[in-house]
């Protein structure tokens, strides 16, 4: 008995599609071996029509595909535009066609039901609108127009020109009779229901001279579109429901085991708490279409999703819907990265953001998720260097470590910084990820002065104290600008044993600016890192003033003031460029700050990492 299993009998009608699901034991070998769909010929040979290795026969070109779901132990063969010629005996299998790992499937494609001659066929999705056209002759122009529904051998009146409306169609049907000279009347049915499916008869006049026209109305419930996304990645549901519902509330819901549909998000402000911080409903276009983005995908997000429109913001029968079946692949290409990053008030966080390594040149962004209404995610920083004004001096996006990961550093943390942030690029939208920043009790590990005033032409020395646990880390100072944080050159004072025996007095890395120039004004960061992986940072603002007193200044943390609140910025305003982002509607236009000037001059700035007992220390 073959371990492969599927449907023995599949039946459909011409023009339709089938989606044949075959199951196999998900062993490591089975998961990765070739999957195929072949047709058994008279000779007994089975000719491949489509395979998981990308082969598609000419007969199936443009209308069939095979998708493997390795973690589920299934593969799906989709065949569209079926014809009677597709009827026959097939096999779905693993490995080589002639070997035994396969399952026999019989496919029968029949003609649609026999319809009276001249029948017009209308195929419409549930919830949409149909317009049935009914021609008539001049002599029947003044006579009664009507639409009947054929149920078995009887005809039930649906609507007529004497203002009768069948209760089943109340408030969603209208009969239109055009002006003189036009020999056609129309019946418009809105918000189609499955029960509207069937054969209709238009009639104008009565007796032997009456005009009749048959209409076959096929109301389809949408076939769910299979969506296959990676764990930790992102999915976008694009929902286009038509102009008829452009001004009606929209929703995305997930079908539960009770066959009801739980609202995930809607335009009335409702949102499922399970999606907090990782969902956005994009504002709709003029045509009523909208999209919903969910990031940080989890296995439990799998299921059937419906989008729709209704004034209540939830599913109601007879309103248009679109459907998706979401599968979440656990064998994800998206690397694990912390979903929660903790920092202390006054301290910092370094967030690692994954991106598709094939898209190293893509623009990188970081945005703050805001839950109000449908959610929005205004950009805070991007790799081209623009930073939102209120984040000046405390936020930077670094391309390091590279090869599929960039880093975002945020310091001077306050409780207001707690929340959800999204990492994204202008490339592969499936790599959008979410991180939550939590502010916890504690003290920052790095201690720097809060506010430093330097004197033009003199020497400035700024200390940065760090705990012993960072003794093996690389220490650095850098000058912040809105294009990044430019590392300042180290002053190598020869080999040092300063950190071998870490004591209370040997935990200092200091920045020296000599002589201080106007260009030195700005934000400086002291930080620790290991290779290309950044740790904590602390920020200090250096203001530069005219010479008042001669001599060198050494600023100790004890004398530090708070960083200035009222720095006058040369701020520019720029709209986020639509072209830079795949779906620009995710983001609001935000004010950003222009570059805050030149970097500190080369040899004038030096970093000294030394023991206060052994002044010969140098730092890496």
């Amino acid at each position: 008995k073959s371990p492969v299993f599927g449907p023995q009998e599949v039946s459909s009608v011409e023009g339709n599609s089938v989606s044949i699901k075959c199951y196999y034991p998900p062993t490591s070998v089975n998961r990765h071996t070739r999957k195929y769909w072949c047709r058994k010929g008279a000779s007994g040979r089975c000719i491949t029509l489509v395979s998981s290795e990308g082969y598609v026969s000419s007969n199936y070109a443009g209308r069939a595909n095979l998708t493997n779901f390795p973690e589920n132990g299934t593969f799906v063969v989709n065949i569209a535009q079926l014809s009677r010629d597709d009827s026959g005996h097939y096999k779905c299998g693993l490995g080589i066609n002639s070997r035994g790992l396969s399952f026999d499937v019989s496919l029968e494609v029949s003609q649609g039901p026999e319809l009276p001659n001249g029948t017009e066929v209308y195929t419409v999705d549930v919830g949409r609108t149909v317009t049935i056209k009914c021609p008539f002759k001049t002599e029947n122009a003044p006579k009664t127009k009507a639409l009947y529904k054929k149920i078995g051998q009887t005809s039930v009146l649906v609507i007529d020109s004497r203002n009768y409306v069948n209760p089943n169609y109340k408030d969603r049907i209208r009969l239109r009779i055009p002006g003189t000279g036009q020999l056609i009347f129309t019946v418009v049915i809105d918000r189609l229901r499955l029960s509207d499916h069937g054969l209709y008869l238009c009639q104008a006049g009565d007796g032997s001279n009456r005009d009749e026209k048959n209409a076959d109305l096929q109301v389809l419930e949408p076939e769910p579109e299979l969506v296959y996304e990676d764990l930790r990645g992102s999915v976008t549901f694009h929902c286009a429901l038509g102009l008829e519902v452009a001004n009606v509330a929209k929703f995305l819901c997930r079908v539960n085991s009770r066959e009801t549909c739980d609202v995930v998000i809607n335009t009335l402000g409702k949102r499922d708490s399970a999606f907090e911080g990782r969902i956005l409903l994009n504002p709709q276009d003029k045509d009523g279409s909208f999209s919903v983005v969910i990031t940080g995908l989890r296995k439990e997000d799998e299921g059937r999703y419906l989008c729709g429109a209704h004034s209540d913001g939830q599913l109601q029968e007879g309103w248009p819907i679109q459907a998706w079946q979401l599968f979440v692949n656990e064998e994800s290409t998206i690397p694990r990265s912390p979903t929660v990053v903790k920092g202390v008030a006054g301290g910092s966080v370094a967030v690692l953001c994954p991106y598709n390594p094939k898209e190293s040149q893509s623009l990188k962004y970081w945005c703050l998720w805001e839950g109000a209404q449908n959610g929005r995610c205004p950009l805070l920083v991007e790799s081209q260097g623009l930073v939102q004004e209120q984040y000046e001096g405390r936020l930077s996006l670094l391309q390091e470590p590279g090869n599929g990961t960039f880093t975002v550093i945020l310091n001077q943390l306050t409780t207001q910084d707690a929340g959800f942030y999204w990492c994204l690029t202008n490339g592969d939208t499936r790599w959008r990820t979410t991180v939550e920043i939590k502010i916890i009790e504690g003290e920052p590990n790095l201690k720097v002065p809060g506010n430093v005033t330097a004197v033009l032409g003199e020497t400035l020395n700024i200390p940065c104290h760090f705990p012993c646990k960072f003794s093996s880390y690389e220490k650095y100072w850098c000058k912040w600008s809105n294009t990044g944080c430019q590392t300042l050159p180290s002053q190598d004072e020869g080999p040092s044993e300063a950190f071998v025996n870490c004591d209370e007095n040997s935990r200092l890395v200091s920045l020296t600016l000599n002589p201080v120039t106007r260009a030195d004004e700005g934000w400086y960061w002291c930080g620790v890192k290991q290779g290309h992986f950044y740790g904590e940072t602390a920020a200090v603002y250096v203001a530069v003033e005219e010479k008042k007193v001669a001599g060198s200044r050494y600023v100790s943390p004890a004398k530090a003031d708070a960083a200035p609140d009222e720095k006058v910025l040369d701020s520019g305003v720029r709209e986020i460029e639509n072209k830079a982002i795949q779906d620009p509607r995710l983001f609001a236009e935000e004010k950003v700050v222009a570059d805050t000037g030149d970097q500190a001059g080369g040899s004038r700035a030096s970093v000294d990492s030394s023991s206060s007992e052994e002044q010969g220390g140098s730092s890496k």
């Epitope: 299993f5 449907p7 009998e9 089938v18 199951y23 419930e221 085991s257 066959e259 059937r304």
Partner: nanobody, 126 residues
């Protein structure tokens, strides 16, 4: 909420026929799957057959031991899934259950189904 009710069970001689029916009430979304299972006294519930549908496409699944003897179908008008059982054998004896789900999971597994009927007893005497 979906309710499933089985009917049509009874006592039949070996070689005879029975027609079971599973009636569904409540809202279903487009594609749907219903499966028939049976449980002999002291044994696990085992797969008999299943039917899935989506639009005008139908998919039928059978356990090897019933293939060619049992036929599963769908009666749209009555919202029922009948199971026609021919050439019955004593080993077909058991309580027959129908299960329903709107997902197309592996129909052979009981875990694939979200709700169940109460069952109907089929006894095949030799």
């Amino acid at each position: 909420e979906v309710q499933l009710v089985e009917s049509g069970g009874g006592l039949v001689q070996a070689g005879g026929s029975l027609r079971l029916s599973c009636a569904a009430s409540g809202r279903t979304f487009g594609s749907y799957s219903m499966g028939w299972f049976r449980q002999a006294p002291g044994k696990e519930r085992e797969f008999v057959g299943a039917i899935s549908w989506s639009g005008s496409s139908t998919y039928k699944y059978y356990e090897d031991s019933v293939k060619g003897r049992f036929t599963i179908s769908r009666d749209n008008a009555k919202n029922t899934v009948p199971l026609q059982m021919n050439s019955l054998k004593p080993e077909d004896t058991g309580v027959y259950f129908c299960g329903g789900t709107m997902e197309r999971r592996d129909p052979r597994r009981t875990s694939a189904y979200d709700y169940w009927g109460q069952g109907t007893l089929v006894t095949v005497s030799s």
